[in-house]
Interface confidence: low
């Protein structure tokens, strides 16, 4: 017989020879990283018709890495469905938890043993340090030192010392987010007051008042024979200016070649989304939470 067959999981014991006599036997062993489970034969004999008797490496099984349980508050997912060497184990954490350690472990051979490439990671609760304190304002739960994932705080402004109140600029409610940071920057509390908007040859049609504070909205229309140059709606913004700027009412030209504008407004109309005042499961600002009486 010529040289005996070769296998992926099994190797010849001893050195192969170019030729073997009829009746001569060769023995195999499982390769490194494989282990033998009986009863399949791991030897063969040179038959009298000069071929080897059938033999297979199906009794040699890949070494397996130890089973790893899901981490507490997370999940371990086998990329290719088995724990054999070469396997990849991927780790993910549940919502509200973050991974400490490697997110992928590999089943590797060390000497003849299959072991994981490192220690399984941990899923640790997402925690935030207290949110920033703000000038002229405060936030709820100022006595709490450790905030958990999605814990929320609500900011409010202090009473102003003068005649004009402090306005809250930014998000009034922020929450502890995914990477242990707060969902938004802390808002600021400051006096925002826009000048009285005067439009000659026109009049205010909404937003009447003597003082115009943050997010005050005013709408205008022009007198007959005048058209609006600018937006018909303006909003008092955080830098105490109107946005868009206060419009003008221009005289409609009587020249037959000039076509007067048909629209009462031009330019973009700003939209204003009021700040979120509470988050599911958290108290509303008007439920007394802003005025905790003892701390």
């Amino acid at each position: 017989c010529e040289a005996p067959p070769t296998f992926e999981a099994m190797e010849l014991i001893g050195k192969p020879k170019p030729y073997y006599r009829v009746g001569e036997r060769v023995d195999y062993k499982c390769k490194k990283g494989y282990f033998y489970i009986p009863p399949l034969a791991t030897h063969t004999i040179c038959d009298r018709n000069h071929t080897w008797l059938p033999v297979s490496d199906e009794g040699c099984y890949r070494e397996m890495c130890p089973h790893i349980r899901d981490p507490l508050n997370g999940e371990a997912i086998l990329a290719n469905g088995s724990y054999e060497f070469g396997a990849e184990l991927h780790f993910i954490c549940n919502e509200g938890y973050y991974l400490i350690g490697k997110d992928i472990l590999y089943c590797e051979l060390k000497d003849t043993v299959a072991i994981w490439s490192g220690k399984p990671p941990l899923c640790e609760k997402i925690l935030c340090t207290p949110p920033p304190k703000i000038k002229n304002g405060k936030h709820t739960f100022s006595e709490v030192e450790v905030f958990e994932y999605l814990d929320a705080v609500t900011y409010s402004c202090d009473p102003a010392p003068g005649p004009d109140p402090f306005s809250l600029i930014g998000e009034s409610m922020i929450y502890c987010g995914n990477n242990s940071t707060w969902s938004h920057a802390a808002p600021e509390c400051k006096v925002v007051k826009c000048r009285f908007p005067v439009v000659e040859n026109g009049k205010q049609i909404s937003g009447f008042g003597k003082k115009f504070y943050y997010k005050a909205t005013v709408m205008f229309e022009c007198d007959k024979g005048y058209y609006l140059n600018g937006s018909d709606k303006i909003v008092c913004e955080s830098n105490s200016t109107w946005d868009p700027p206060v419009p003008k009412c221009l005289k409609v030209s009587t020249s037959p070649t000039t076509k007067s504008p048909t629209s009462s407004a031009s330019g973009p109309r700003p939209t204003y989304k009021p700040p979120v005042s509470n988050y599911p499961g958290y108290p509303k600002p008007d439920e007394g939470i802003l005025n905790n009486l003892d701390d």
Partner: antibody, heavy 116, light 109 residues
Framework: QVQLVQSGGGVVQPGRSLRLACAAS????????MHWVRQAPGKGLEWVAV????????YYADSVKGRFTISRDNSKNTLYLQMNSLRAEDTAVYYC?????????WGRGTLVTVSS | QSVLTQPPSVSGAPGQRVTISCTGS?????????VHWYQQLPGTAPKLLIY???NRPSGVPDRFSGSKSGTSASLAITGLQAEDEADYYC?????????FGGGTKLTVL
């Protein structure tokens, strides 16, 4: 004035249940995290359970997990600790306490004795 | 066995300075969580003595002070007085669990 008044302690047989109450005055319990802490006779303090201000999060010490339940009745401004399957090692003075990371107000404590 | 380790007892003469140590680990004090101290006079409920490592609630004398470094913290009491004789507990936090030290009995000689 701001205080916590406790009730519900007593002698109980192993395996039985008991409910402790902690009535708050001078502040609203649902604005704060509220805890239970216990102290076995002659021993140190052991944290037992907490309920977050919104009631959505409850945490327990491993020694009581699955047996004790912390709850709150906002209308009565009262905190509760329902203790089931009591064991001899649960014998202790139980304190309710207010606060987040630290406990700035404590009840006077109520003695729970588990004995046959 | 407590996760936070305190000496079982300390003592000092009136007017002296004593310190009580509290040793934790990288998962509690060493992870950046604050340390708080409670005083328990015989037969009474504990009382907050120091919060946030070194802050005193109103009404606590400035003879009491706290500090924190790495995985440990300490409480210092200066000008020891007879009424300071009590049990003292340190406290901190780790994921979802509030921790107490085993307590230290302070004896005023």
């Amino acid at each position: 004035q701001v205080q916590l008044v406790q009730s519900g302690g007593g002698v109980v047989q192993p395996g039985r249940s008991l409910r402790l109450a902690c009535a708050a005055s001078g502040f609203t319990v649902n604005n704060y995290a509220m805890h239970w802490v216990r102290q076995a006779p002659g021993k140190g303090l052991e944290w037992v359970a907490v309920i977050s201000y919104d009631g959505n999060n409850k945490y327990y010490a491993d020694s009581v997990k699955g047996r004790f339940t912390i709850s709150r009745d906002n209308s009565k401004n009262t905190l509760y600790l329902q203790m089931n399957s009591l064991r001899a090692e649960d014998t202790a003075v139980y304190y309710c306490a207010k606060g987040g990371g630290y406990f700035d107000l404590w009840g006077r404590g109520t003695l729970v004795t588990v004995s046959s | 066995q407590s996760v936070l380790t305190q000496p079982p007892s300390v003592s000092g003469a009136p007017g002296q300075r004593v310190t009580i140590s509290c040793t934790g680990s990288s998962s509690n004090i060493g992870a950046g969580y604050d340390v708080h101290w409670y005083q328990q006079l015989p037969g009474t409920a504990p009382k907050l003595l120091i919060y946030g490592n070194n802050n005193r609630p109103s009404g606590v004398p400035d003879r009491f002070s706290g500090s924190k470094s790495g995985t440990s913290a300490s409480l210092a009491i200066t000008g020891l007085q007879a009424e300071d004789e009590a049990d003292y507990y340190c406290s901190s936090y780790t994921s979802g669990t509030w921790l107490f030290g085993g307590g230290t009995k302070l004896t005023v000689l």
